[in-house]
């Protein structure tokens, strides 16, 4: 009888094992082992037992011990099971960004590994098992479908193999694939909202705002704003699921014409874009031309208004005749025209919008001086010792300087409150002078002096005022 020990062995691939072949007869004619594996006999005393070292075991094998005894020939097999973990555990590549609501198929491929009966493939999200299946086929493939949710954002998906040799007295061998980090996103089907001026004037700045709601994760959204070839540099502010990108756009004469304004939002592997046209125009303010901005009274003045060739102008509310970019009016300058504003309003149609520009010029009319009875009365009669304010207003442009002197030396304080004394009486020569010339006017001041009359048996003094020309006394009058 031939026996073998051990009858069953589980060993790692490439490993070695000692196999003992024994026979029950004392003097066997023949005792040996049949195997394709490299073998080495270990020398032992006695004839009925032999020990072999089998090495480099790469696959399951069944070496057979045999013996030839007087009573006959017999054999015994040992079962060598080789174990090894898979050489490749891999999740099939997927785009890292996945839209929420999409069915995502996770596919795990496993190459190698034995014994397959003990090999299980597990698909996981984080530590949560999604699917567990025995490894079947070469390569073994396990798939599962996941409905992408918003809360999956940033989740790690992986595939794990479990070679469970615990029933055989060994351990559980695990191999894990490289994780796949899922980036979920929501990019709404609606294009971004773009708010910008439809028309923009050369050498000015405009503000462009691009916004979109319902984004996830909003912080990962990329916003590209451009006007023609000019990339804009927006300031982006974020809400919970929205953003607003605000940029300043400056345009020059080179940009004149119709330009394309684009706002593109890129999130994940998708994008939304809004296009808008902006018309860039040049429209200088109209020019108001006065023959001379400062003229003397009676001068003929031409006021011209000139604007952009395509503009239509009105001058002081009167449209050009015929309607067009030029208007003019003629006038003879009067004092009433001093400070008069001539306003030219020009209107230009740009991309269906009416643009208005104004320019105003003021006319200065030099006139005067004037001194008349209404503003500078020729006669004043005041009671002595009363408080009076001599008033004499000279008119003209420029405003004339006014002096009223008596005897070429004594001033009358115009516009000042004075106590009326006899000194004040007399005729004053008022002279108004400006760069436009001078005028004179005589002003007489009469002082009413009290005269006291005593009645015989009267009840007292009657104060009677009469206009009285006062003699000039040296002691009362004084040069400035």
């Amino acid at each position: 009888q031939t026996s073998v020990s051990p009858s069953k062995v589980i060993l790692p691939r490439g490993g070695s094992v000692l196999v003992t072949c024994s026979t029950s007869c004392d003097q066997p004619k023949l005792l040996g082992i049949e195997t394709p594996l490299p073998k080495k006999e270990l020398l032992l005393p006695g004839n009925n037992r032999k020990v072999y070292e089998l090495s480099n075991v790469q696959e399951d094998s069944q070496p057979m011990c045999y013996s030839n005894c007087p009573d006959g020939q017999s054999t015994a097999k040992t079962f060598l099971t080789v174990y090894w973990t898979p050489e490749r555990v891999e999740l099939a590549p997927l785009p890292s960004w996945q839209p929420v609501g999409k069915n995502l198929t996770l596919r795990c491929q496993v190459e190698g590994g034995a014994p397959r009966a003990n090999l299980t493939v597990v698909l996981l999200r984080g530590e949560k098992e999604l699917k567990r299946e025995p490894a079947v086929g070469e390569p073994a493939e396990v798939t599962t479908t996941v409905l992408v949710r918003r809360d999956h954002h940033g989740a790690n998906f992986s595939c794990r193999t479990e070679l469970d040799l615990r029933p055989q007295g060994l351990e559980l061998f695990e191999n894990t694939s490289a994780p796949y980090q899922l980036q979920t996103f929501v990019l709404p089907a609606t294009p971004p909202q773009l708010v910008s001026p439809r028309v923009l004037e050369v050498d000015t700045q405009g503000t462009v705002v691009c916004s979109l709601d319902g984004l996830f994760p909003v912080s990962e959204a990329q916003v590209h704003l451009a006007l023609g070839d000019q990339r804009l540099n927006p300031t982006v502010t974020y809400g919970n699921d929205s953003f607003s990108a605000k940029a300043s756009v400056s345009v020059t004469a080179e940009d004149e014409g119709t330009q394309r304004l684009t706002c593109a939002v890129i999130l994940g592997n998708q994008s939304q874009e809004t296009l808008q046209t902006v018309t860039i125009y040049s429209f200088p303010a109209p020019n108001v031309i006065l023959t001379k901005p400062e003229v003397s009274e009676g001068t003929e003045v031409t006021v011209k208004c000139e604007a952009h060739p395509r503009a239509k102008v009105t001058l002081n509310g009167v449209p050009a005749q015929p309607l067009g970019p030029r208007a003019q009016l003629l006038l003879k300058a009067t004092p009433e025209d001093n400070g008069r504003s001539f306003s030219c309003s020009a209107t230009l149609e740009v991309a269906g919008q009416l643009i208005h520009k104004n320019q105003t010029r003021e006319l200065r009319v030099l006139y005067g001086p004037r001194l008349d009875e209404r503003d500078c009365p020729g006669n004043w009669t005041w009671p002595e010792n009363s408080q009076q304010t001599p008033m004499c207003q000279a008119w003209g442009n420029p405003l004339p300087e006014l002096k009223c002197l008596k005897d070429g030396t004594f001033p009358l304080p115009i516009g000042e409150s004075v106590t009326v004394t006899r000194d004040l009486e007399g005729t004053y020569l008022c002279r108004a002078r400006s760069t436009q010339g001078e005028v004179t006017r005589k002003v007489t001041v009469n002082v009413l002096s009290p005269r006291y009359e005593g009645g015989s048996g009267g009840s007292g003094l009657n104060d009677i005022f009469e206009a009285q020309k006062i003699e000039w006394h040296e002691e009362n009058l004084y040069f400035q």
């Epitope: 070429g408 030396t409 304080p413 002691e475 004084y478 040069f479």
Partner: antibody, heavy 117, light 110 residues
Framework: QSVEESGGGLVKPGGTLTLTCTVS????????MGWVRQAPGKGLEYIGI?????RTYYASWAKGRFTISKTSTTVDLKITSPTTEDTATYFC??????????????WGPGTLVTVSS | AYDMTQTPASVEVAVGGTVTIKCQAS??????LSWYQQKPGQRPKFLIY???KVASGVPSRFKGSGSGTEFTLTISAVQSDDAATYYC????????????FGGGTEVMVK
């Protein structure tokens, strides 16, 4: 327009001296003319004025000691019984009405009067 | 009586500095006040009239102010050429006046 004084020089105390101011470029019928003096190292001192109407006005201290008169082109200042205290440079000044400046804008160069025995 | 009191009698000021001269009338002369500058051996030069109006050709560094009885002449950014005696003169007709001029202020520039 100008004014110029003449007639200054050495005068004995108690004598009489008349200074003359000759004007050109304006009319005395429309301008008042005055006299101001300045003793050596001292301040300006107003003496008096003759108005455009020929009336005369004097500082309180000058009454009786000075007399101002005029012709069509000259203005005279007569100093009666001068004393050594009357030693000064005498300026003829035009009231500046025409130039709208209240002050003596037009001044003569001055004439020096020395009162000494 | 309309008497003029001028202060100070003399003042020293550095180049670039500011000097203020005051003139007080014994009663209101409204705005009828003039200021003069006189250098040794020269006739007075007219600076300001009507208390605050600057005569033609006078630098804007000279500024007059006041009305009634209190008046001021201010010279800012003083230059060495401003060294002189300055007089105020009341130009309002009145009686019993000893002198139309203030006593003068000598301005020395260091």
């Amino acid at each position: 327009q100008s004014v110029e004084e003449s007639g200054g020089g050495l005068v004995k105390p108690g004598g009489t001296l008349t200074l003359t101011c000759t004007v050109s470029g304006f009319s005395l019928s429309t301008h008042a003319m005055g006299w101001v003096r300045q003793a050596p190292g001292k301040g300006l001192e107003y003496i008096g004025i003759i108005g455009s109407s020929d009336r005369t006005y004097y500082a309180s201290w000058a009454k009786g000691r000075f007399t101002i008169s005029k012709t069509s082109t000259t203005v005279d200042l007569k100093i009666t019984s001068p004393t050594t205290e009357d030693t000064a440079t005498y300026f003829c000044v035009r009231d500046p009405y025409d130039s709208f400046d209240d002050g003596y804008r037009l001044w003569g160069p001055g004439t020096l009067v020395t009162v000494s025995s | 009586a309309y008497d003029m009191t001028q202060t100070p009698a003399s003042v020293e000021v550095a180049v670039g500095g500011t000097v203020t001269i005051k003139c007080q009338a014994s009663q209101s002369i409204y705005s009828y006040l003039s200021w003069y500058q006189q250098k040794p051996g020269q006739r007075p030069k007219f600076l300001i009239y009507d208390a605050s109006k600057v005569a033609s050709g006078v630098p804007s560094r000279f500024k007059g102010s006041g009305s009634g009885t209190e008046f001021t002449l201010t010279i800012s950014a003083v230059q060495s050429d401003d060294a002189a005696t300055y007089y105020c003169q009341q130009a309002y007709s009145s009686s019993n006046v000893d002198n139309a001029f203030g006593g003068g202020t000598e301005v020395m520039v260091k």
